[in-house]
């Protein structure tokens, strides 16, 4: 952890990334014993709080401004030097979001991955954006940073992500930011959840009253499995978003969870898949497709009494 | 298409205050932030500032700090430029001009101050 | 602050010829450099953004380039509607600084 050389290493918690008004804790990890040390500011747009102090063990830093963006360098208290302090530390980069409109962020080809498959996250916005940062959420690193490509008055940048494996599965959000403030990020992207299937056993997935129903008669599909999923995940071919449910145990030792569709309108292929509160990203192989097929007059949608799942919230815990 | 138009000419005494506007139309108001660009009769183009129409914060360059201030009426998509205590210095021909690279330039106000 | 030194400060050109004004900068700007056109009476008109991205709109006889510190506008077939006062502009790092200008006229 130490930086090595005499130099400290600085290090921000939670993250880099920090909202306006939201706090960070800069820490200055240097030599055992030696906790204090001084913070300063790179560029030209000084905060007036560092000069001439001296911290121990960590500064907490905000609420944050706008001004707070840019990068940051310590030096660990060293008594018995000449100058009584280290080598500066490694640069570390604060970034303020919140300063414009958010961009989207889209999953090609989709935001569910079997382990090795490789994902492109596209951030856009009609913001003309000069960089685009990705950062998946609970990592304290700097984000990934691409320059935006302008076409048709958008601008974009393709995130590889891949190829997949369990670290790389969570929340995703991207930013942007102009030129000449290039570390005043805008609000986040709606959060994208990238999950990635196939590290568990299948579950099954059958209808009641059965996979072929007269138009208007009550749908249920059940998904269930000998696994003690705490989730299952109902998906629908065609539809982005999936519905999820709380698994429940059953008399027999099966864990099951039954989602109804309400009256039947028109027919789907349906998919379910299981996963644990522990790693709500990582999800089971995937059931057996299920069609449903609905005979007599289909309309065009299917209501759903069943609360559909949001964009995301996947990731995180159901409580 | 993406427009900025600016209001009219103004003549005012030294000490008195004048208010521009900058109503742009065409695209999404808060996408972009806005620049103000001064033009002094025979002299070339300066900066003053820019205001994130986003977060309605300004940043204002040395030159212009105190007597200036930029606002913003986003409801209307109009951009504001203020100056107080004017002095003759401040003749000039000002512009508001959008996002980062100064894409899309009003017409210009051309302020006089003269007792 | 950026010091962006433009040259020639003025020049006379005939109908077709060539024309190259450029801008220096004092420090490194990336390739954060605008062209502006201005004429009387007119708003200012954007050619180039990221020293050499053509505004849709502007006629392709425009171009620009460079990086760093050394950029340059050009006009492969000078016609008569192109003479005004053409100023770049870094947008790199706040405060924006403009050239000093290039005032061309026709020959």
């Known amino acids: 952890l130490m930086g090595g050389q005499d130099k400290p290493f600085l290090s921000a918690r939670p993250s880099t990334v920090v909202p306006r008004g939201g706090h960070v804790a800069l820490q200055c990890h240097y030599r055992r014993g030696f906790n204090n040390f001084m913070l300063y500011k790179e560029d030209r747009s000084h905060v007036p709080i560092f000069h001439g102090r001296i911290f121990q063990e960590s500064f907490i830093m905000g609420p944050v401004t706008p001004a707070h963006a840019g990068t940051y360098r310590c030096r660990g208290s060293r008594p018995h030097s000449l100058t009584g302090w280290s080598a500066p530390s490694n640069p570390l980069v604060i970034m303020v979001t919140g300063n414009h409109r958010k961009p989207s962020l889209l999953a090609h080809p989709g935001p569910l991955l079997k382990s090795g498959e490789t994902v492109i996250l596209q951030c856009w916005s009609d913001v003309m954006f000069e960089h685009f940062f990705l950062h998946r959420e609970g990592i304290s690193e700097d984000p990934s940073r691409l320059v935006g490509q302008i076409h048709d008055g958008v601008s974009k940048a393709n995130f590889s992500i891949g190829p997949m494996m369990l670290a790389l599965a969570g929340t995703y959000r991207c930013y942007g930011s102009v030129p000449h403030s290039p570390y005043q990020l805008s609000a986040p992207s709606d959060p994208l959840d990238i999950v990635i299937t196939g590290l568990y056993e299948k579950p099954s997935l059958s209808a009641q009253p059965g996979p072929t129903v007269q138009a208007g008669e009550n749908v249920t599909l059940s998904c269930s499995s000998w696994s003690s999923y705490d989730i299952y995940h109902l998906s629908r071919e065609g539809e982005a978003h999936e519905r999820r449910l709380r698994a429940v145990p059953k008399v027999n030792r099966t864990f099951q969870a039954d989602f109804p569709l309400g009256p039947a309108t028109h027919g789907g292929t349906y998919r379910c898949f299981g996963s644990f509160r522990a790693l709500p990203c990582v999800w089971s192989n995937s059931s057996d497709p299920l069609l449903v097929s609905v005979t007599g007059n289909p309309s065009s949608s299917w209501p759903s009494p069943t609360e559909p799942s949001s964009k995301s919230g996947i990731c995180r815990h159901l409580h | 298409q993406i427009q900025l138009v600016q209001s009219g000419p103004e003549l005012k005494n030294p000490g008195e205050t004048v208010k521009i506007s900058c109503k742009a139309s065409g695209y999404i108001f808060t996408n972009y932030g806005m620049n103000w660009v001064k033009q002094a009769p025979g002299k070339g183009l300066k900066w003053m500032g820019w205001?994130?129409?986003?977060?309605?914060?300004?940043t204002y360059a040395d030159d212009f700090k105190g007597r200036f201030a930029f606002s913003l009426e986003t409801s209307a998509s109009t951009a504001y430029l203020q100056i107080n205590n004017l002095k003759n210095e401040d003749t000039a021909t000002y512009f508001c001009a959008h996002g980062p690279w100064l894409a899309y330039w009003g017409q210009g106000t051309l302020v006089t101050v003269s007792t | 602050d950026i010091k962006m030194t433009q040259s020639p400060s003025s020049m006379y050109a005939s109908l077709g010829e060539r024309v190259t004004i450029t801008c220096k900068a004092s420090q490194d700007i990336n390739s954060y450099l605008s062209w502006f056109q201005l004429k009387p009476g007119k708003s200012p008109k954007t050619l180039i953004y990221r020293a050499n991205r053509l505004v849709d709109g502007v006629p392709s006889r425009f171009s620009g380039s460079g990086s760093g510190q050394d950029f340059s506008l050009t006009i492969s077939s000078l016609e008569c509607e192109d003479m005004g006062i053409y100023y770049c502009l870094q947008y790199d790092e706040l405060p924006y600084t403009f050239g000093g200008g290039t005032t061309l006229e026709i020959k």
């Open positions: 205001i994130n129409t986003y977060t309605g914060e300004p």
